[in-house]
């Protein structure tokens, strides 16, 4: 998969779950960079991938609700991202400054199911995103103007 | 009811550009992605790519990367497919395409009446 | 990219009598992770739009007839009109929803 950012160090993957969907994020920022992440799949936490430190904001996803796209930004290391949901929320961590680029799924009604990359020891080297089709589709028409998010205002 | 309601035939000479829009109606045009395809005449159907209204994002069929442009308006909830560099074997029915409700899978359940475009000389 | 393949091109069936059409398909289509194949059917007649009929290789469009059936997983798929209807002349195509979008050539069904 495409991966974004100039790369190098160890590699780091979130666990191969076929019977559950990611419903929360941990995003761990420090000194202006981001040092790791950690998903949650379904009740569990999966291992946090990346470096040691910094201070975590803790995301949960709704029932039903899943990632649908991502900005990134790099400056030699990850300095932030932008997470937008299916149900008109994003979540932002770190800054977005440096080299911005989006990721998005290539087929229509895939979520994110997975993330994976590179660390060195101050924080993520480069990140991919892995995208899947949810395990149980939405049957009903989109969700009209939710209004809160978790640390930032509505928009996608 | 859902509809979708697409530009008139068009005529074109070989290197010209062609865009055809897609108006769309009884549907908030930012909530599904907007795909197109096309039908040469007696052959069959080909995938052009897609436009995210709510955003812009995009994705074509490499065989048209480079050469296609997807857009929309959504102050007039309206997507364009442009094709620049036409050739003859361009000559095909257009149609705007979009999924149905019950799936977030893009099965195409509406589609477009179809735009002719004919690429002549 | 993935190639569908549809078998025969055209076929000619007795009014009440089942019609069969095959398709192949590159590569798998069934996702390892919902269990589902991604695959739909779609019929169009002159001077029309596709119709869908057909998604996640066997599930029927709300309003369909219910003598059109799909059946298959993996990489081979069919469509069956358990009794053919004259209404039911048209083009018939398979579709991948897998990775990016492909159709399958078409076959063209007729009374015979």
């Known amino acids: 998969g495409k991966m974004y950012g100039p790369g190098g160090g160890k590699y780091f993957s979130t666990t191969e779950d076929y019977d559950h969907e990611i419903t929360g994020l941990r995003v761990s920022v420090g000194l202006l960079l981001v040092k790791s992440v950690q998903v949650k799949l379904g009740d569990s936490w999966d291992v946090k991938l990346g470096a040691l430190g910094g201070n975590t904001q803790e995301v949960t996803l709704q029932p039903g609700e899943y990632i649908t796209k991502v900005f990134v930004a790099f400056q030699a290391f990850l300095r932030g991202m932008v997470m937008y949901t299916s149900k008109d929320r994003y979540f932002y961590f770190g800054k977005l400054d440096g080299q911005i680029s989006s990721a998005y799924p290539s087929q229509e009604g895939q979520v994110l199911v997975g993330i994976y990359g590179q660390y060195q020891l101050l924080g993520i080297k480069s990140i991919g995103f892995e995208w899947n089709y949810p395990l149980e589709e939405p049957t009903t028409e989109p969700p009209v103007n939710l209004t809160y998010s978790a640390n930032s205002p509505v928009g996608r | 009811q859902v509809q979708l309601v697409q530009s008139g035939a068009e005529v074109k000479k070989p290197g010209a550009s062609v865009k055809v829009s897609c108006k769309a109606s009884?549907?908030?045009?930012?909530?599904?992605?907007m795909h197109w395809v096309r039908q040469a005449p007696g052959q069959g159907l080909e995938w052009m790519g897609w436009?995210?209204?709510?955003?812009?994002?995009?994705n074509y069929a490499q065989k048209f990367q480079g050469r296609v442009t997807m857009t929309r308006d959504t102050s007039i909830s309206t997507a364009y497919m442009e094709l620049s560099r036409l050739r003859s074997d361009d000559t095909a029915v257009y149609y705007c395409?979009?999924?149905?409700?019950?799936?977030?899978?893009?099965?195409?359940?509406?589609w477009g009446q179809g735009t002719l475009v004919t690429v002549s000389s | 990219d993935i190639v569908m393949t549809q078998s025969p091109d055209s076929l000619a069936v007795s009014l009440g009598e089942r019609a069969t059409i095959n398709c192949k398909s590159s590569?798998?289509?069934?996702?390892?992770?919902?269990?589902?194949?991604?695959l739909a059917w779609y019929q169009q007649k002159p001077g029309q739009p596709p119709k869908l009929l057909i998604y996640?290789?066997?599930t029927r469009e709300s309003g369909v007839p219910d003598r059109f059936s799909g059946s298959g997983s993996g990489t081979d798929f069919t469509l069956t009109i358990s009794s053919l209807q004259a209404e039911d002349v048209a083009v018939y195509y398979c579709?991948?929803?897998?990775?990016?979008?492909?159709f399958g050539q078409g076959t063209k069904v007729e009374i015979k």
């Open positions: 996640w290789a066997s």
């Open positions: 436009i995210d209204p709510e955003n812009g994002n995009t």
């Open positions: 590569q798998s289509l069934l996702n390892s992770r919902t269990r589902k194949n991604y």
């Open positions: 395409a979009r999924r149905a409700i019950t799936t977030a899978t893009a099965w195409f359940a509406y």
């Open positions: 009884g549907f908030n045009i930012k909530d599904y992605y």
């Open positions: 579709k991948q929803s897998y990775n990016l979008y492909t």
